[in-house]
Interface confidence: medium
């Protein structure tokens, strides 16, 4: 008769470092002491007729255990295979690029250390919860890669690596380990440079708006903008509208920046940069300044009028040009009554990069002269009808402007000048029209002949 030696449990599965209770039993009636052969740490727990129980501790790797016993002088054996499973010690997704261009491939890399049995270990690369790649864990450490085409939708998406130790066939379930997620930042930066709108010329101490625009940028809110006039950084206000970025600044030129300069606009996103440059000439254009040797001159005095402007500026005073750019234009005159209120015009021209810039300035001369009454405007003999409406059209001139009064001789009767009044026979007579100012008096005699109203 053949007797058997049973080993229980048969082909068990346990977690790494665990313990196992093993029972060896035989139906042989005359068996000797049962022995357990194993490289593992073992301890006889109990034994009896035809059976022995052992405890195996700190089981770290797969092993085969063998029970043997002598039965009627011949050896019988039984065996069991222990399968040990262990979760990976480390699951790590390698860092992603700081910025990834949309439309270009990038590589996801996951490294897995430990985990057994390897035949049951799978490595999964994920975007959100979407599986991108599923591969067996091959070497130790297992290194799994997947190539991903970056899209706009990937901006801010978490990528992770998951291990699956499938012990379901052994009735133990699916053990999942997941790496810390890593977030991807994707971007689009067009190859075209920004559009830079800036003045060609900028006068010292003046301000002008500068605009820099770039379309097709993603994410526009993450872009950095640098606007500068030469080495002077401009304080830009940046606005985003969809995929368009607009930076606006005010450029103010300093005196030390005079000459050929550049306005620069840099847009940086994802570690890449797009740049636009525009040439600009900073110029200084002083004047023109028109001066009178005497702003208020006495009649008959000599007045000098001069016009000056900055270097390289050509000035022309009342049609008379200065000898050369940068020089002063001058003219002299004997002040007369007719020069009072006269304006002297100076035009200045500056050439900047082949373009001519023009400026004008003027000054008005005051000439002081005594009062006069213009005979042409003040008739000396007036024939008016009684009970009619008339205006005494007399005008005085002088600087300072004189006061004009017309008084009837022999009385203090005054007729209004320049405004309508009703004439009657009492107005008949001779009038002294006198213009007076701080510079003297001027008198003109006016006779009013009033024809009485006749009723038939």
């Amino acid at each position: 008769q053949e007797f058997l030696l049973r080993v229980e449990p048969q082909n068990p599965v346990l977690s790494a470092g665990g313990s196992l209770f093993v029972n060896c039993s035989t139906d042989c009636p005359s068996s000797e002491k049962i022995a357990l052969e194993t490289s593992l740490s073992k301890e006889l727990v109990a034994s009896g007729m035809g059976w022995a129980a052992f405890n195996l501790s700190n089981v770290t790797g797969n092993s085969r255990i063998l029970c043997s016993v002598y039965c009627n002088g011949s050896q019988i054996t039984g065996s069991s295979n222990i399968t040990v499973y262990g979760l990976p010690e480390r699951v790590e997704l390698a860092p992603l690029p700081p910025w990834q261009p949309v439309g270009q491939n990038f590589t996801l890399r996951c490294q897995v250390e430990g985990g057994s049995p390897r035949t049951s270990l799978t490595v999964v690369l994920l975007r959100w919860e979407e599986e991108l790649s599923r591969q067996p864990a091959v070497e130790e450490p297992a290194e799994v890669t997947a190539t991903v085409l970056a899209s706009r939708d990937d901006h801010g998406a978490p990528f992770s690596c998951r291990t699956e130790l499938d012990m379901q066939p052994q009735g133990l379930g699916l053990f999942v380990n997941t790496s810390a997620p890593r977030q991807l930042r994707t971007f689009v930066l067009p190859v075209t440079p920004p559009r830079l709108v800036a003045p060609r010329f900028l006068e010292v101490e003046t301000s002008w708006p500068v605009d820099c625009t770039l379309d097709g940028l993603f994410p526009a809110s993450e872009a950095q903008v640098y606007l500068a006039l030469g080495d002077q950084m401009l304080n830009a206000t940046v606005m985003n509208h969809g995929d368009t970025l607009t930076a606006t600044a005010t450029a103010t030129a300093r005196a030390d920046q005079e000459g050929a300069r550049e306005i620069v606009c840099n847009v940086t996103l994802g570690g890449e940069r797009r740049e636009a440059r525009e040439n600009l000439t900073v110029f200084s254009f002083l004047g023109p300044i028109v001066n009178l040797s005497e702003p208020t001159a006495h009649e008959g005095s000599t007045v000098t009028v001069s016009c000056m402007a900055g270097a390289r500026v050509q000035v022309t005073l009342d049609g008379v040009p200065a000898a050369a750019p940068g020089q002063t234009a001058q003219l002299q005159l004997n002040a007369t009554e007719s020069d009072d209120g006269r304006s002297f015009f100076c035009s200045a021209t500056l050439e900047v990069d082949g373009e001519f810039l023009h400026r004008n300035s003027s000054v008005q001369l005051r000439v002081l002269y005594g009062p006069k009454i213009d005979r042409a405007t003040c008739p000396q003999h007036l024939k008016w009808k009684d009970k009619t409406r008339h205006v005494l059209q007399c005008q005085a001139r002088g600087n300072p402007y004189p006061e004009l009064r017309c008084l009837k001789e022999g009385s203090s009767r005054e007729v209004p000048v320049g405004i309508p009044f009703f004439v009657n026979v009492t107005h008949n007579g001779t009038y002294q029209c006198q213009a007076s100012s701080s510079r003297g008096k001027y008198t003109l005699v006016v006779v009013m002949d009033i024809e009485a109203f006749s009723s038939h």
């Epitope: 890399r109 070497e139 450490p141």
Partner: antibody, heavy 119, light 112 residues
Framework: EIQLQQTGPELVKPGASVKISCKAS????????ILWVKQSHGKGLEWIGK????????TYNLKFKGKATLTVDKSSSTAHMQLNSLTSEDSAVYYC????????????WGQGTSVTVSS | DAVMTQTPLSLPVSLGDQASISCRSS???????????LHWYLQKPGQSPQLLIY???NRFSGVPDRFSGSGSGTDFTLKLSRVEAEDLGVYFC?????????FGGGTKLEIK
């Protein structure tokens, strides 16, 4: 063109150390694994170990653990192998090679560096 | 370690002949993922080894179709349908299923 350029021959004294280098070009250095192989007259080709330039992780043939140290310098796309406590047994030609994850074969090899250990 | 045994040690051939090299492993080279990581390399005189065949039967880019690989488990073969002068050198088989990776001792293909 993918190339692995190794440093020139070395003549070293017993007990000394030597560091040989392998500069990669024509591909993304961190995308492939670098392996080192020894070829000596008596023993044919022997695999020393491998290094993943991206993670810097290494796997050694136990026979060469303590003898060889593998490192990489990502900034210059260069792999290094230092051999220490040299004896005449270490006289050989040492090759660097690369492999992709799949196929798991050494698809490109360096030209080899001859190391002679002699007093 | 997986010990790789190549036969013959030397293979004298005439140009245009067929040649066959055998490689046997001391353990199965089938990985738990189902792939078999057995590769063939050629080392021409004074040169570094170069990859011919990877994973039993896949020709590496630029390798002529007169080279073919076959086999499974522990027994593998490299065949050359028509030997040309540029094929002369030492042929090595190698496995990367198990760490450490190991190589065969080499087969020298030479002219009769």
């Amino acid at each position: 063109e993918i190339q692995l350029q190794q440093t020139g021959p070395e003549l070293v004294k017993p007990g000394a150390s030597v560091k040989i280098s392998c500069k990669a070009s024509g591909y993304s250095f961190t995308d492939c694994i670098i392996l080192w192989v020894k070829q000596s007259h008596g023993k044919g080709l022997e695999w020393i170990g491998k290094i993943n330039p991206y993670f810097g992780t290494t796997t050694y043939n136990l026979k060469f653990k303590g003898k060889a140290t593998l490192t990489v310098d990502k900034s210059s796309s260069t792999a290094h192998m230092q051999l220490n406590s040299l004896t005449s047994e270490d006289s050989a030609v040492y090759y660097c090679a690369r492999k992709e994850a799949y196929p798991d074969a050494m698809d490109y090899w360096g030209q080899g560096t001859s190391v002679t250990v002699s007093s | 370690d997986a010990v790789m045994t190549q036969t013959p040690l030397s293979l004298p051939v005439s140009l245009g002949d067929q040649a066959s090299i055998s490689c046997r492993s001391s353990q199965s080279l089938v990985h738990s993922n189902g792939d078999t990581y057995l590769h063939w390399y050629l080392q021409k005189p004074g040169q570094s080894p170069q990859l011919l065949i990877y994973k039993v039967s896949n020709r590496f880019s630029g390798v002529p179709d007169r080279f073919s690989g076959s086999g499974s488990g522990t027994d593998f073969t490299l065949k050359l349908s028509r030997v040309e002068a540029e094929d002369l050198g030492v042929y090595f088989c190698s496995q990367s299923t198990h760490v450490p990776y190991t190589f065969g001792g080499g087969t020298k293909l030479e002219i009769k």
